[in-house]
Amino acid sequence: SPSPVPPSTALKELIEELVNITQNQKAPLCNGSMVWSINLTAGVYCAALESLINVSGCSAIEKTQRMLNGFCPHKVSAGQFSSLRVRDTKIEVAQFVKDLLVHLKKLFREGQFN
């Protein structure tokens, strides 16, 4: 089963993938699909997956979805939302990914890999 504590290498690989799909990108990611904004202070991997898993048919984030699935200790399915969701706030996938990226880089620099 997936480890609840992703190693630093896995986190770095996730950061690199998020960079890959956002670098110099101005066109709407996933055709401008909207996802629920999440609270980035705790349980970020599962919360991010719970939000992004509701986006289908977007090849650009499929690898990210798979990587997040490996970081989350429990099974996540579409339509599932934790209390980490920011109530009634949706943002574009591109902004979600950029916000997530900034946060994950902060965690990496602080040595917080879980």
Partner: antibody
Framework: EVQLVESGGGLVKPGGSLRLSCAAS????????MSWVRQAPGKGLEWVGR??????????NYAAPVKGRFTISRDDSKNTLYLQMNSLKTEDTAVYYC?????????????????WGQGTLVTVSS | SYELTQPPSVSVSPGQTARITCSGD??????AYWYQQKSGQAPVLVIY???KRPSGIPERFSGSSSGTMATLTISGAQVEDEADYYC???????????FGGGTKLTVL
């Protein structure tokens, strides 16, 4: 003061090697993506390649004319960027600039910053 | 390999509006950047992400993008704006940079 200073240019014979350095100061170098750009005498700017910050993977990309001959590296402990140039050709003669890379400027690290060095001349001639 | 195409030269009288275009197949999804280079000097960024102006760049410089075309506009061109202008972007992967061939702006 934010600045980049290149060094290591000079005259080299075709087939020879040269290593350029770019010393950075005044900003958090480790967060920055860095590029090398060259300009042949009387010609336009040509993108040579880039290196991402280590946290973004540290990966490198190169323009087709230099791929396999040039290698970009960085030493964040010394705030220095390098360009190792092997199998040099006469058409590599140019002023070589190091610069912060705008494409990597999105993630709260150095957004909107743009810095170029003064350039160093590389002449490849027999 | 991916290319960006610019006109070799543009001429305007002082006070007129100069427009320099840059075309590339990936520009609908990738940002354009514009650099000014005066003789013997390093390039200076004047527009980033299609239309954003760095601090210290005069307001007469503006940028826009539509489809496969990015445009640098200098409203009320000054003699000191005479320089070479280069557009810069990346290919569709975002991994490889490319410059346009450059446009020599003459302010007569």
């Amino acid at each position: 003061e934010v600045q980049l200073v290149e060094s290591g240019g000079g005259l080299v014979k075709p087939g020879g090697s040269l290593r350029l350095s770019c010393a950075a100061s005044g900003f958090t170098f480790s967060n920055a993506w860095m590029s090398w750009v060259r300009q042949a005498p009387g010609k336009g700017l040509e993108w040579v390649g880039r290196i991402r910050s280590e946290i973004d993977g540290g990966t490198t990309n190169y323009a087709a004319p230099v791929k396999g001959r040039f290698t970009i590296s960085r030493d964040d402990s010394k705030n220095t960027l390098y360009l190792q140039m092997n199998s040099l050709k006469t058409e590599d003669t140019a002023v070589y600039y190091c610069a912060t890379d705008q494409v990597g400027a999105y993630y709260g690290d150095y957004y909107g910053m743009d810095v170029w060095g003064q350039g160093t001349l590389v002449t490849v001639s027999s | 390999s991916y290319e960006l195409t610019q006109p070799p030269s543009v001429s305007v009288s002082p006070g007129q509006t100069a427009r320099i275009t840059c075309s590339g197949d990936a520009l609908p999804e990738k940002y354009a950047y514009w650099y000014q280079q005066k003789s013997g000097q390093a390039p200076v960024l004047v527009i980033y992400e299609d239309s954003k102006r760095p601090s210290g760049i005069p307001e007469r410089f503006s940028g826009s993008s539509s489809g496969t075309m990015a445009t640098l506009t200098i409203s009320g061109a000054q003699v000191e704006d005479e320089a070479d202008y280069y557009c810069h972007s990346t290919d569709s992967s975002g991994n490889h940079g490319v410059f346009g061939g450059g446009t020599k702006l003459t302010v007569l």
